[in-house]
């Protein structure tokens, strides 16, 4: 009696169970009464990453330098190429199909987490006692200068964008 279901790594065709092709190979002929499933290796720059009955291998992803992409891991016959972004850029999605420039944190904000190839800069507002006076993708909020430790006094209060201005203490004459 013809099978209605097949074992793992097999598929049903023409009332018989045929072996699937292993990762890295594509199907060129279903099995017959007289022959096993016939598979051929994927070509250069192609891959298949599962047991399959695909008649065409998939093309490796192209890491387009015009989109800021570069190869993080070269593809094999069984794996796709993994792209990442050039220094200073990060992926716009999990699939990393294009890159955008890392965001800079504006004055008044500091870098909480430096960007990676896959995540953007995370900024945070500078809390009281800290400031940032530059637009930067790397600079954290800096603490206000402590005038006291320099034996000086605050002449101008700091803000989230400016440091305090210290000056000499008034001397009693």
């Amino acid at each position: 009696e013809p099978p209605t279901a097949c074992r793992e790594k097999q598929y049903l065709i023409n009332s018989q169970c045929c072996s699937l092709c292993q990762p890295g190979q594509k199907l060129v002929s279903d099995c017959t009464e007289f022959t096993e499933t016939e598979c051929l290796p994927c070509g250069e720059s192609e891959f298949l990453d599962t047991w399959n009955r695909e008649t065409h291998c998939h093309q490796h992803k192209y890491c387009d330098p015009n989109l800021g992409l570069r190869v993080q891991q070269k593809g094999t016959s069984e794996t796709d190429t993994i792209c990442t972004c050039e220094e200073g850029w990060h992926c716009t999605s999990e699939a990393c199909e294009s890159c955008v420039l890392h965001r800079s944190c504006s004055p008044g904000f500091g870098v909480k987490q430096i960007a990676t190839g896959v995540s953007d800069t995370i900024c945070e507002p500078c809390p009281v006692g800290f400031f940032s006076n530059v637009s930067s993708a790397f600079e954290k909020c800096h603490p206000w200068t402590s005038c006291e430790t320099k034996d000086l006094v605050v002449q101008q209060a700091g803000t989230n964008k400016t440091d305090v201005v210290c000056g000499p203490q008034d001397r009693l004459r």
Partner: antibody, heavy 114, light 112 residues
């Protein structure tokens, strides 16, 4: 029913290229492979190669450098070309449908001689 | 490539008597699927080869039941229980488990 018919010149000069055609009926070239097999007079059978449904090919490594198999799906024809032939290539050449091993063509005798 | 070795190469048999042909392969013909793709063909004088047995022991449709195939791994046998006049010709074993497909040298069966 499945039928295959081999055709081509019966005489080829040494160092020239042997060209044969296999015309098939009863099955579809876009969904089935075709093999070429040869048999020198009074000797055994030798598998030459196959062209699969999608156009991919496998060849006998001993003949690979001289053999090309191609096809024209619209004409239901498969072609065998073998370059730089010698007297050792004198044989009956058969084509065979993949999965139809019960049906062989009648074969065509190719003699390599000057 | 898988080398197929047949014996004997010549087999004179009396009509009505049994006959046996051996075929050995240089490596196992068992595919990872568990199937073994070993065929037997008969080439009658002046004709193309005709399929007798496939997958070691399956008789092709229309093949008389006096023909039987057996074996496993690398050792295979074709038996004819009672030879008839129409059985004369050259018998070939063939493997299609591994590319390139290969054939035995052939065994010529003739009537004594």
């Amino acid at each position: 029913q499945v039928q295959l018919k081999e055709s081509g010149p019966g005489l080829v000069k040494p160092s020239e290229t042997l060209s044969l055609t296999c015309t098939v009926s009863g099955f579809s070239l876009p969904t089935s492979g075709v093999h070429w097999i040869r048999q020198p007079p009074g000797k055994g059978l030798e598998w030459i190669g196959v062209i699969w449904a999608g156009g991919d090919t496998n060849y006998n490594s001993a003949l690979m450098s001289r053999v090309t198999i191609s096809k024209d799906n619209s004409k239901s024809q498969v072609f065998l070309k073998m370059s730089s032939v010698t007297a050792a290539d004198t044989a009956v050449y058969y084509c065979l449908g993949h999965g139809h091993f019960d049906v062989w063509g009648q074969g065509t005798l190719v003699t390599v001689s000057s | 490539d898988v080398v197929m070795t047949q014996s004997p190469l010549s087999l004179p048999v009396t009509l009505g008597q049994p006959a046996s042909i051996s075929c050995r392969s240089s490596q196992s013909l068992v595919h990872s699927s568990g199937n073994t793709y070993l065929q037997w063909y008969l080439q009658r004088p002046g004709q193309s080869p005709g399929l007798l047995i496939y997958k070691v022991s399956n008789r092709f449709s229309g093949v008389p039941d006096r023909f039987s195939g057996s074996g496993s791994g690398t050792d295979f046998t074709l038996k004819i229980s009672r030879v008839e006049a129409e059985d004369v010709g050259v018998y070939y074993c063939s493997q299609t488990t591994h590319v390139p497909w290969t054939f035995g040298q052939g065994t010529k069966l003739e009537i004594k």
